[in-house]
């Protein structure tokens, strides 16, 4: 039961995380105008990965896309790439993890296959989350650098009568959405990897043990027993001996590491 919950929760957390990464990537508020030096501006600027916007106090908002590819800073291109890679990996991870979910039956898929798929999706979620966190962090670093550069410029060459207020940008909402979403995807991935350990049938070598159950003839094989954690539809080791009706989740609570064959 714990493994099913861990896997399910990992999937849900990753799903929310990837939705957040997509939202952050599409958002226009990656950087917003810093109002510290000019809190009474009637024009508010903010920028995203794909376009920059201006919101006038009168309520009108105008956005312009970055229609050039070569003219954009390399760092912005890198952030775009990281976010897209994160989304693609996350999307593939979601697709894989849907089939890996224990609660979903696909033909006679073995536990080992589901375990492998769970691990694959988990790794994909971890990389996806790291890509998003890296992308957002690179952008944030770029903002901090530009902020202090523009601050230095503000206080130079202002001996003249005319003041030119340079627009400075600070962290926008998308950065926080990206960090949280990346973190959630990462956590979801870790949970999937943990769930995979519970799903994976471990090879163990137990000596043959004779069991005698009243009223039943119990067959057993000496040698390599596959120790089941009780998760997944283990078709090879399925209820030849059934001492009363039980659900699979109840079977998992058995303390014994031996399967009846």
């Amino acid at each position: 039961m714990a493994v099913t919950a861990c896997q399910g929760l990992g999937f849900v957390v990753s799903l929310i995380g990837i939705a957040g990464i997509i939202a952050a990537t599409c958002m226009d508020q990656w950087s917003t105008q810093d109002l510290y030096n000019n809190p009474v501006t009637a024009v508010f600027n903010y920028q995203g990965l794909w376009r920059s916007c201006v919101r006038e106090s009168s309520g009108f908002t105008e956005c312009r896309g970055y229609f050039t590819l070569l003219g954009l800073p390399a760092m912005l291109q890198a952030v775009r790439a990281l976010m897209i890679v994160g989304i693609v990996l996350g999307a593939i991870g979601l697709l894989v993890s849907i089939f890996a979910l224990k609660c979903i039956r696909i033909g006679s898929m073995e536990d080992s296959a589901k375990a492998n798929m769970t691990l694959t999706s988990g790794i994909m979620f971890i990389v996806s989350g790291l890509c998003a966190i890296a992308g957002v962090s690179v952008f944030a670093n770029m903002l901090v650098t530009n902020f202090w550069m523009s601050t230095a410029n503000m206080y130079t060459g202002m001996g003249g009568m005319v003041q030119t207020v340079q627009t400075r940008y600070t962290f926008g909402a998308a950065l926080f959405v990206g960090w949280v979403a990346g973190g959630l995807t990462l956590i979801g991935g870790v949970m999937m990897c943990i769930a995979c350990r519970g799903l994976a049938p471990e090879e163990t070598n137990y000596k043959a043990v004779s069991y005698h159950a009243s009223g039943h003839s119990v067959a057993y094989k000496p040698g390599g027993f596959k120790a089941s954690t009780g998760f997944g539809s283990n078709t090879k080791n399925k209820k030849i001996y059934d001492g009363g009706a039980r659900t699979e989740d109840e079977v998992q609570s058995y303390p014994s590491k031996h399967d009846y064959v």
Partner: antibody
Framework: QVQLQESGPGLVKPSETLSLTCTVS????????VSWIRQPPGKGLEWIGV???????NYHSTLISRVTISKDTSKNQVFLKLSSVTAADTAVYYC???????????WGQGTLVTVSS | DIVMTQSPDSLAVSLGERATINCKSS????????????LTWYQQKPGQPPKLLIY???TRESGVPDRFSGSGSGTDFTLTISSLQAEDVAVYYC?????????FGGGTKLEIK
């Protein structure tokens, strides 16, 4: 079409509060801002303040301690209150709608307010 | 506060001639985000409320004759009437629409010579 109409008492005593109403039609007060501007006789225009669609306000720094702008969106009305008036507050008071570029694209006809005892 | 200074205070121009009014701001009105100058020009005829002519320093309001044009950037702006008509006699105001308070210039009175 867009229309704005100022109304209120034409005469106010010194030290009292000037209260004016701007009734609008043809646009929504939740979407557009409305500014108050005044013009003393024979002089230039002076911006008083504005109330934006979201309800936020901005006032002229010289009047901020005396002025309040509010609105009743259900009645399509914007209100101006100017306290502790003096003869220097005698002017034609206009309300105007804010449009593109924060420019005032539609104006009321204005109402003359005289401050005198 | 941004101070708007208009020049000249009054101007007399012959009918059909070009009229030029200048406006200078104490701070730049250029917004880096969209490269637009938040300066507006108004026309006020005697006994009437002001009328919007030009916003964003050079964009004509709909219905405004094309003889009116605005130019300039940053802190220096110009309103030009290419061929003065009798109905253009009025007081012209520039306004800062970039930073609060949204200050007006002192006005330029345009008359016919």
């Amino acid at each position: 079409q867009v229309q704005l109409q100022e109304s209120g008492p034409g005469l106010v005593k010194p030290s009292e509060t000037l209260s004016l109403t701007c009734t609008v039609s043809g646009f929504s007060l939740t979407s557009y801002g409305v500014s108050w501007i005044r013009q003393p006789p024979g002089k230039g225009l002076e911006w008083i303040g504005v109330i934006w669609g979201d309800g936020s306000t901005n006032y002229h720094s010289t009047l901020i301690s005396r002025v309040t702008i509010s609105k009743d969106t259900s009645k399509n009305q914007v209100f101006l209150k100017l306290s502790s008036v003096t003869a220097a507050d005698t002017a034609v008071y206009y309300c105007a709608k804010a449009g593109r570029g924060n420019a005032l694209d539609y104006w009321g006809q204005g109402t003359l307010v005289t401050v005198s005892s | 506060d941004i101070v708007m200074t208009q020049s000249p205070d009054s101007l007399a121009v012959s009918l059909g001639e070009r009229a030029t009014i200048n406006c200078k701001s104490s701070q730049s009105l250029l917004n880096s985000g969209n490269q637009k100058n938040y300066l507006t020009w108004y026309q006020q005829k005697p006994g009437q409320p002001p009328k919007l002519l030009i916003y964003w320093a050079s964009t004509r309001e709909s219905g405004v004759p094309d003889r009116f044009s605005g130019s300039g950037s940053g802190t220096d702006f110009t309103l030009t009437i290419s061929s003065l008509q009798a109905e253009d006699v009025a007081v012209y105001y520039c306004q800062n629409d970039y930073s609060f308070p949204l200050t007006f210039g002192g006005g330029t009175k345009l008359e016919i010579k």
